[in-house]
């Protein structure tokens, strides 16, 4: 009689993540008497992966019905496929002996390979503000995919980058892996609308690319433009200066008004306009009373913005040609957002 | 479900015999092996063997060989394990487990003394 | 025949703590035949870890199993008042299947 051959007919096998494998084995002949045990990977440290008659595997079923008394068919289903399962498989038949069952004769090898789809792509940005004509970085993660070919791409409100560094790990072979790559990106005044898109495309998408995406709005700082001018007189002894606070972003400012180099008034912007481009413009205006003076008057509107160092604007105010109001110790008079009086 | 339902317990002499029995439900009963392991009071777990129910094939721990006598009856679902020659010392829980290690059965007191 | 060696005998912690404990084989035993198994007075032990680190249906995540060779380990991260119990390492890897003695994870 001819000597047992144990068969694996599928030199390879391709299968997606989550799904199930099936692993196909038959012998050739029931003598030797003797059990099929599945491992995977060769060697003393090879994995078993299912055991006919001993042991816990609770995603392996069999195909058929191992007790039947002439079954010849070992072929496996492994379910919830992971990329960790890849590997080679094979299908060793034993036989009986003592203490322990001896291998007699192994199938060749099925080789499992796993289609596993990229993570969405994180896209992250600086962790500081950066300010228009400012190269900026920025970092696009994605992981646990398989096979290794992978496509990845940069826009800027849809107009692709080319300046950009990618790397994918590792450079051997594993059971997944994971892409990074960096970016450059030089900011505008108009950036604050603008999207950083990460872009990538795997076998596993089916044409289908995934996208990450970081709104710049996170990254700029559009520092204002300051504008401080007087304005006719409103009342006798009184002069309205105003402070225009152009094209700014983020929202977070802070204004102070200084007289010959004294604080006046301090103020948040609240309420703000928008401008199409996304950046804010805010105003404020103080109403000097110039009988208060003896001199001419040095106004500054002083602004903090988003934490920076503070920028400002100076406008001189001349007293001279104004009488000076008797009993008046009224040196400003805020007429802003809420209407206070300052002493 | 899987079930193992083993028999009562059992006081004996020392010298005699005891025969524990291990009846399976919910599970094809020649798939896999059934192993006995015992516990003596206060004490570890102890393999005493196995036998495989689709064709009665045996291993033992050799500690055992000589007293113990595994057997099976395919046509009810039920392993037997028998021990001869008992001592005190065999005193203890014995249990039938699955060859998958997750299901045991209840466990049965057997209680040596004369 | 290969000997497990469980340590410690012992172990007194209180509920929340981290529990580490370990299994040593007198030769290598392959990671695939490695089991942990849970005993709590009057019942039959409980399969946690199969495969020296795959958890078993039902078993809590904090729950779990590391090592190969000859050096393996049972990891409880944060102990819930019914983790007091014995556990037990046991190797199929070769005749005769052997269990360690055991671990006692008492309240401290």
């Known amino acids: 009689e001819e000597e047992l051959q144990v068969i694996q007919p599928d030199k390879s096998v391709l299968v997606a993540a989550g799904e199930t494998a099936t692993l196909r084995c038959t012998a050739t002949s029931l003598i030797p008497v003797g059990p099929i045990q599945w491992f995977r990977g060769a060697g003393p440290g090879r994995e078993l992966i299912y055991n006919q008659k001993e042991g816990h595997f609770p995603r392996v079923t069999t195909v058929s019905d191992l007790t039947k008394r002439n079954n010849m068919d070992f072929s496996i289903r492994i379910g919830n496929i992971t990329p960790a399962d890849a590997g080679t498989y094979y299908c060793v038949k034993f036989r009986k002996g003592s203490p322990d069952d001896v291998e007699f004769k192994s199938g060749a090898g099925t080789e499992l390979s796993v289609r596993a789809k990229p993570s969405a792509p994180v896209v992250s940005g600086p962790a500081a503000r950066a300010t228009p004509q400012h190269t900026v970085s920025f970092t696009c993660e994605s992981h646990g995919f398989s096979p290794r070919d992978i496509t990845l791409k940069w826009f800027k409100n849809g107009n692709e980058l080319s300046d950009f560094q990618t790397n994918v790990d590792p450079v051997g072979e594993s059971v997944s892996y994971s892409i990074h790559s960096t970016a450059k990106v030089v900011l505008t005044r108009e950036d604050v609308h603008s999207q950083v898109i990460c872009e990538v495309a795997h076998v596993t998408l089916q044409g289908d690319p995934l996208r990450g995406t970081a709104n710049l709005s996170e990254t700029i700082r559009v520092p204002p433009t300051l504008e401080v001018t007087q304005q006719p007189v409103r009342a006798e002894n009184q002069v309205n200066v105003t402070c225009q606070v152009r094209k700014f972003y983020p929202q977070r400012l802070q204004l102070t008004w200084l007289e010959n180099g004294n604080v006046s008034r301090t103020e948040t912007a609240s309420t703000v306009t928008e401008n199409k481009d996304g950046t804010y413009n805010w105003m404020s205006w103080l109403l000097v009373n110039v009988s208060a003076h003896r001199d001419d008057v040095k106004l500054t509107c002083q602004v903090e913005h988003d934490g920076q160092p503070a920028v400002s604007k100076s406008h001189d105010l001349k007293v001279s040609a104004h009488p000076k109001e008797q009993g008046s110790n009224t040196a400003a008079e805020n007429t802003g957002s809420n209407e206070r009086n300052i002493y | 479900q899987v079930q193992l339902v083993q028999s009562g317990a059992e006081v004996k002499k020392p010298g005699a015999s005891v025969k524990v029995s291990c009846k399976a439900s919910g599970f094809n009963f020649e798939d896999t092996y059934i192993h006995w392991v015992r516990q003596a009071p206060g004490q570890g777990l102890e393999w005493m063997g196995r036998?495989?129910?689709?064709?009665?094939?045996?291993k033992h721990n050799p500690k055992f060989h000589d007293r113990v006598t595994m057997t099976v009856d395919t046509s009810t679902n039920t392993a037997y394990m028998e021990l001869s020659s008992l001592r005190s010392e065999d005193t203890a829980v014995y249990y039938c487990v699955r060859g998958n290690y997750v299901n045991w059965g209840q466990g049965t007191t057997v209680t040596v003394s004369s | 025949e290969i000997v497990l060696t469980q340590s410690p005998a012992t172990l007194s912690l209180s509920p929340g703590e981290r529990a580490t404990l370990s299994c040593r084989a007198s030769s290598s035993v392959t990671s695939s035949y490695l089991y942990w198994y849970q005993q709590k007075p009057g019942q039959a032990p409980r399969l946690l870890i199969y495969?020296?680190?795959n958890l078993a249906s039902g078993i809590p995540a904090r729950f779990s199993g590391s090592g190969s060779g000859t050096d393996f380990t049972l990891t409880i991260s944060s102990l819930e008042p019914e983790d007091f119990a014995v556990y037990y390492c046991h190797q199929w890897y070769s005749y005769p299947r052997t269990f360690g003695g055991g671990t006692k994870v008492e309240i401290k």
């Open positions: 036998i495989d129910p689709a064709d009665g094939d045996t």
């Open positions: 495969s020296a680190s």
